[in-house]
């Protein structure tokens, strides 16, 4: 930003209004008028070119400094060219002397030049020459200086001619300051420019109203430099949560927006399924019957949680239950669905009822499923079981209700034992099988029936309470067809799937286990 | 003592020219500028001019460069304002104020003349 | 042109309480004058070179300012202040004068 200059002194501004003092009195410095533009022109000037040695000294007003640690000394004057006098004026000079005096008060009339401080010489860029000065086209020059720290109440400055033909049309006086400024949504004080070159004022900004600084980030500083100008911005402010960035302020969400943090972002509208926010809104409220998990961010919509699963199918296969569902028609709106499976069984005798998480085998874990269908196993036969699945998402835990569709299923076989070939001879066959325990105590006997494979008319019978019987008396080289069945008080088990077993041919020799 | 004498209230017509006079008295005529302001009734004050009667060098507002010429008289001390081609607008009380020397502001001023335009 | 406005155009005021007007530059000015303006009479300068005070003007008159903000202030109002005061810049041209603050007596 532009330094901004604070004046202290403006003779063109002022004239006459200021009671300057020459010195000596009378001689020298004298003050004129001209008419520029429809302007009085005021001027000091003295053109004692001809007289030999000068010591003419104009000293301005007593300038209080007040905050001023650096003044700036802007001149506006002319000088003409010595050589325009006649014979070249051998005393005659083409510069003057600034001066300047620090006080703590103000001596009046009373100039001591012992007390001022040469600042420099000034000498013109451009000297009129006799021609301009007849065709009144006269050079004007600009020169600037300055001179701090100041330390004292007050100054004065003084102006030497030692012999030249100068008028002196403008002097401002001035201090610079870093001007209040507003960068970053952080408003920076008018600040008053430091009096050394190198260094830089700090200034720590403040933020707007409704504005913060960042979790995390810097505070906002900025550099005030000796020419007035703010440099090196460090850190920044961000409207709070509720309001937005507009131009250098920061503004209320309207209603129906929100902003939940503060961030560069702007409002936002508030999503599906929520009511109007107020003027200023972090978020918005769910509609009635509608959620936010706790991280689900302020800008997703409100959610329910699912209806029930769609459609549920138990298929039961001996004492297992194939369980199969789909999506529930209402997802609530998330994507997060998660299914849980239960299960009860009921004695069909005493219609007592419990549960059997227990005693069954889930073909994986039955809470948190993704899949739509699970198989439970280990189930006892003679038994009714219902199942529950139960749809859940994000939200489902906001609420008391549940989403759940049941299934019943009765297991009135055992699980089909599995059977396998322990070993076989030319004549026989050992045979062994296994059901789940929990189902082993409900059995009474075993069954095994066997007959030649491609003869229907005749099977033979086995019954044994043991898991594995050998089948004797067997053709050699035959192949035979042996199922196993589990009895139980109630009747038959499910049977085994039928498997082809055969005898060893008669060059085969020893009992071999296969 | 420092003196500014105007002359009289004026009644003109439409189109009409008026010459406003100015008498200075109390101190060195050649001196100071004389300046002219207009205050139109129940308002604020408007710099019209000025004029430096030590050379007759003069300077306007440029809003009344085609509407005033000033003019002085040193043997007399007196300083005037011409308004022509007169309108309703020009209905104001005339001042004439003499600047402070060499300076930006006016430190005496004469009692003002009214001048009334209308048919 | 410098536009000056001054702030309030009317204000009123008891005897002995303190009494502030302001002028307002539409660009930055080196100096405020002010002059005093009663009824039926001539403008009188007040305070010149922003903080001068005329000859004649009573001590509890005071002006200040800088740059485009410039008031004038009276630290305890006298029935004889009630007029009203307008403030002037000339460090452009043209000078142009502000609409003026009539002060009453309450």
């Known amino acids: 930003a532009q330094g901004k200059e604070v004046v202290l002194l403006d003779f063109a501004a002022a004239g006459g209004e200021l009671g300057w003092l020459t010195h000596p009195y009378g001689k020298g410095w004298d003050l004129m008028q001209n008419i520029m533009n429809d302007m009085p022109i005021y001027m000091y000037s003295v053109c004692n070119v001809m007289s030999g040695d000068q010591d003419n000294w104009l000293r301005t007003n007593w300038v209080y400094r007040g905050e001023a640690e650096r003044i700036f000394i802007e001149l506006k004057f002319t000088v003409r060219d010595c050589n325009s006098f006649p014979g070249g004026a051998s005393s005659c000079k083409e510069t003057f002397n600034l001066y300047y005096a620090e006080s703590d008060l103000d001596y009046g009339t009373n100039f001591q030049k012992r007390l001022f401080t040469k600042i420099d010489t000034i000498a013109p860029d451009e000297i009129t020459v006799s021609s301009d000065f007849e065709a009144r086209h006269v050079k004007l020059n600009v020169e600037e200086r300055s001179v701090g720290p100041l330390t004292r109440k007050g100054f004065y400055l003084a102006f030497q001619d030692i012999g030249a033909c100068v008028a002196l049309l403008s002097v401002r006086v001035y201090y610079k300051k870093c001007p209040e400024l507003l960068q970053g949504l952080a408003h920076f004080p008018e600040t008053i420019a430091g009096s050394d070159a190198p260094s830089l004022a700090t200034v720590a900004g403040t933020c707007v109203d409704h504005a913060v600084v960042p979790p995390g980030g810097e505070e906002p500083r900025m550099h005030c430099a000796v020419d007035g100008e703010w440099l090196v911005p460090i850190g920044q402010c961000l409207c709070q949560a509720g309001y937005e960035k507009v131009e250098d302020a920061c503004q209320a969400c309207s209603p129906g927006f929100f902003k939940f943090e503060a961030s560069e972002s702007p409002c936002l509208e508030c999503p599906e399924h929520t009511l109007p926010s107020p003027e200023g809104a972090t978020s918005c409220e769910c509609e009635e019957g509608f959620f936010r998990a706790p991280q689900d961010p302020a800008s997703m919509p409100c959610t329910r949680p699912p209806s029930a699963p769609h459609y549920l199918t138990a298929v039961g296969m001996g004492a297992k239950v194939e369980l199969r569902w789909t999506p529930p028609q209402d997802s609530g709106g998330r994507e997060d669905i998660v299914y849980s499976v239960t299960c009860e069984q009921c004695w069909p005798e005493s219609g007592e009822c419990g549960p059997c998480e227990a005693s069954v085998r889930y073909s994986e874990p039955p809470h948190g499923l993704t899949r739509t269908s699970v198989t439970v196993s280990d189930l006892e036969p003679h038994m009714n079981y219902t199942f529950t699945v139960e749809a859940r998402n994000g939200v489902s835990g906001l609420v008391t209700s549940r989403s759940f569709r049941t299934a019943s299923v009765s297991i009135n076989q055992t699980e089909p034992p599995k059977v396998r070939l322990e070993g076989r001879s030319t004549t026989s066959l050992s045979v062994s099988w296994s059901i789940p325990p929990p189902q082993q105590s409900r059995v009474w006997k075993y069954e095994v029936t066997y007959r030649k494979k491609g003869d229907s008319n005749s099977y033979n019978v086995r019954r044994t309470e043991g898991f594995s019987v050998t089948l004797d008396d067997l053709a050699p080289d035959t192949t035979y067809l042996v199922q196993v069945q589990a009895l139980t008080q109630e009747g038959q088990g499910a049977g085994s799937k039928v498997h082809e077993f055969q005898t060893l041919s008669p060059e085969g020799s020893g009992n071999l286990a296969v | 003592e420092v003196q500014l004498q105007q002359s009289g209230p004026e009644l003109v017509k439409p189109g009409a020219s008026v010459k406003i006079s100015c008498k200075a008295s109390?101190?060195?005529?050649?001196?100071?500028?004389m300046h002219w302001v207009k205050q139109s009734h129940g308002k604020s004050l408007e710099w019209i001019g000025f004029?430096?009667?030590?050379?007759?060098?003069?300077g306007y507002n440029q809003r009344f460069k085609n509407k005033a010429t000033l003019t002085v008289d040193t043997s007399s001390s007196t300083a005037y304002m011409e308004v022509r081609s007169l309108t309703s607008e020009d209905s104001a009380v005339y001042f004439c104020?003499?600047?402070?020397?060499?300076?930006?502001?006016?430190?005496?001023w004469g009692q003002g003349t009214t001048l009334t335009v209308s048919s | 042109q410098i536009v000056l406005t001054q702030s309030p155009a009317l204000m009123s005021a008891s005897p002995g309480e303190k009494v502030t007007m302001t002028c307002s530059a539409s660009?930055?000015?080196?100096?405020m004058y002010w002059y005093q303006q009663k009824p039926r009479s001539s403008p009188k300068p007040w305070i010149y070179?922003?903080?001068n005070l005329a000859s004649g003007v009573p001590a509890r008159f005071s002006g200040s300012g800088s740059g485009t903000s410039y008031s004038l202030t009276i630290s305890s109002m006298e029935a004889e202040d009630a007029a009203t005061y307008y403030c002037?810049?000339?460090?452009?041209?043209?000078?142009?004068f502000g609409g003026g603050t009539k002060l009453e007596i309450k």
């Open positions: 104020a003499r600047g402070y020397y060499y300076g930006r502001h006016f430190d005496y």
């Open positions: 109390g101190y060195t005529f050649t001196d100071y500028n």
């Open positions: 004029i430096y009667p030590y050379n007759g060098g003069t």
């Open positions: 660009s930055s000015v080196s100096y």
């Open positions: 070179i922003t903080s």
């Open positions: 002037q810049q000339w460090s452009s041209n043209p000078p142009t």
